[in-house]
Interface confidence: medium
């Protein structure tokens, strides 16, 4: 099965990918696992999320958004990376709370993108993701009150693309982190539509495999996912067009940043 281009996508651009496999369509493979992965979309020239079945597929599949961008976007590392001191919030500030696998009780802090504040949470002690700070001050300094730099006109600043919690490195290096800049990606806080359009794709609780679409507020697009037939949430549409009609209207057109496509 392959991810199709969005209804609203333009024709295939002239940008040449770094590798031939970056031009392949997303292939979720024949297996039935539901693994959040990323692929490079030749039509949008962006790395986007898709659901991988767990076996076969092709090389246009990455565990993290960052890995996809580094591999498939020409010049990404040279031109799209700048230090956190001069950037907006690092991407890990927008990762969901992840207490990890263990059952310890460690008081930690994370940035909550809904409330725009750093909040306390209980960390189990192992694994998890980098939205995990030992002190409230550290969390605030990195995610709540980052140093802003002026952004070019007609460019939407990167502030909220969803990444996989697997890309974790030592917390002590957080002040030296390089932050990817991804133009043309609307931020979640620029969204004023229906609240369920901000919810992550939820495959539900049953065992069916139904093709559905969910709105990804990070990319401003509707993506396909497999729905198991029961449970889940309201960010679940039978067609991409319905999904776009329901959720795309909530994007704010911001004068200082240009029109969000």
């Amino acid at each position: 099965l392959s991810e199709e281009a969005d209804d609203t996508d333009s024709e295939l651009g002239s940008m040449k990918p770094l590798h031939t496999f970056c031009a392949m369509k997303a292939d979720d493979g024949p297996c039935k696992a539901m693994i959040r992965s990323y692929f490079f979309n030749m039509y949008t020239h962006q790395c986007e999320e898709f659901i991988y079945g767990g076996c076969e597929g092709n090389e246009n599949r990455f565990d993290t958004l960052e890995e996809c961008k580094k591999t498939c976007i020409p010049g990404y590392e040279k031109t799209a990376v700048k230090a956190a001191s001069g950037a907006e919030r690092p991407d890990f500030c927008f990762l969901e709370e992840d207490p990890g696998l263990c059952r310890g009780y460690m008081k930690r802090y994370l940035y909550n993108n809904q409330t725009k504040q750093c909040e306390r949470f209980v960390y189990g002690g192992c694994l998890g993701n980098r939205n995990n700070f030992e002190t409230l001050d550290e969390c605030k300094k990195i995610c709540e009150n980052p140093v802003h730099s002026p952004s070019p006109v007609n460019e939407v600043q990167m502030s909220d693309y969803v990444t996989d919690g697997n890309t974790v490195t030592d917390r002590s290096t957080v002040n030296n982190i390089v932050v990817p800049q991804s133009p043309k990606v609307p931020r979640r806080r620029d969204y004023r539509g229906r609240p369920w359009c901000l919810q992550p794709a939820d495959s539900g609780l049953c065992k069916a495999s139904e093709r559905r679409f969910y709105y990804n507020s990070a990319t401003g697009k509707c993506h396909r996912f497999n729905y198991t037939g029961c449970g889940g949430n309201n960010n679940n549409f039978t067609t991409r067009r319905r999904c776009l009609r329901s959720c795309k209207t909530g994007l704010i057109k911001n004068k200082s940043k240009g029109v969000v496509k």
Epitope: M34, G100, R103, G104, G125, V168
Partner: antibody, heavy 117, light 110 residues
Framework: QVQLVESGGGLVQPGGSLRLSCAAS????????MTWVRQAPGKGLEWVSA????????YYADSVKGRFTISRDNSKNTLYLQMNSLRAEDTAVYYC??????????WGQGTLVTVSS | DIALTQPASVSGSPGQSITISCTGT?????????VSWYQQHPGKAPKLMIY???SRPSGVSNRFSGSKSGNTASLTISGLQAEDEADYYC?????????FGGGTKLTVLG
């Protein structure tokens, strides 16, 4: 009794793919995080990947990130490890283990993966 | 990231006590009860001997005990027996990894 049985190992050429399975029995599979650990011939143990009980989060060692994919099917009490772009240094016995809060209290017997041309 | 260092080998005679150390390079090891120990006989799967620094799973002999002081965890085996000859691994974790020490080969002399 509580048991884990791995399968799917074998000989594969560099760059090839292999899918390991781990069948669990004797315990409530969907209540436990699960882990893959490997051991190269004559070497020590190396953690490879872990997955939460409901499959919602997955974790990988740097050495396999982007090449290996862990998944599980709780309806079948089975854990999987899809290994792509295999390298000679991936040659090892692969164990699946039950992850009880960061330690591994139940282990399978292991399955040997040999990557060689 | 956390890294764990063990001695390559230790030895002892039957009836003696031996201690295997496991030193962490990260403060995580010193600040949290994160250490477990595994025994592995040649050709066999590892077996959990100690978890949460000093807890013993059911079925493991009380000759095995664990402790921790600062950044160093220790496994002590008292009343050494021939069947204790095996490789022993310490293991811990942090935000990024579940980590094993390099392993210690225990030889029971005589």
């Amino acid at each position: 009794q509580v048991q884990l049985v791995e399968s799917g190992g074998g000989l594969v050429q560099p760059g090839g793919s292999l899918r390991l399975s781990c069948a669990a029995s004797g315990f409530t599979f969907n209540s436990y995080a699960m882990t893959w650990v490997r051991q190269a011939p004559g070497k020590g143990l190396e953690w490879v990947s872990a997955i939460k009980s409901d499959g919602s989060n997955t974790y990988y060692a740097d050495s396999v990130k982007g090449r290996f994919t862990i998944s599980r099917d709780n309806s079948k009490n089975t854990l999987y490890l899809q290994m792509n772009s295999l390298r000679a240094e991936d040659t090892a016995v692969y164990y699946c283990a039950r992850n009880d809060s960061g330690w591994f209290d139940v282990w399978g017997q292991g399955t040997l993966v040999t990557v060689s041309s | 990231d956390i890294a764990l260092t063990q001695p390559a080998s230790v030895s002892g005679s039957p009836g003696q006590s031996i201690t295997i150390s496991c030193t962490g390079t990260s403060s995580d090891l010193g600040g949290f009860n994160t250490v477990s120990w595994y025994q592995q006989h040649p050709g066999k799967a590892p077996k959990l001997m100690i978890y949460s620094v000093s807890s013993r799973p059911s079925g493991v002999s009380n000759r095995f005990s664990g402790s921790k002081s600062g950044n160093t965890a220790s496994l002590t085996i008292s009343g050494l027996q021939a069947e204790d000859e095996a490789d022993y691994y310490c293991q811990s974790y942090d935000l990024n990894n579940l980590v094993f020490g390099g392993g210690t080969k225990l030889t029971v002399l005589g």
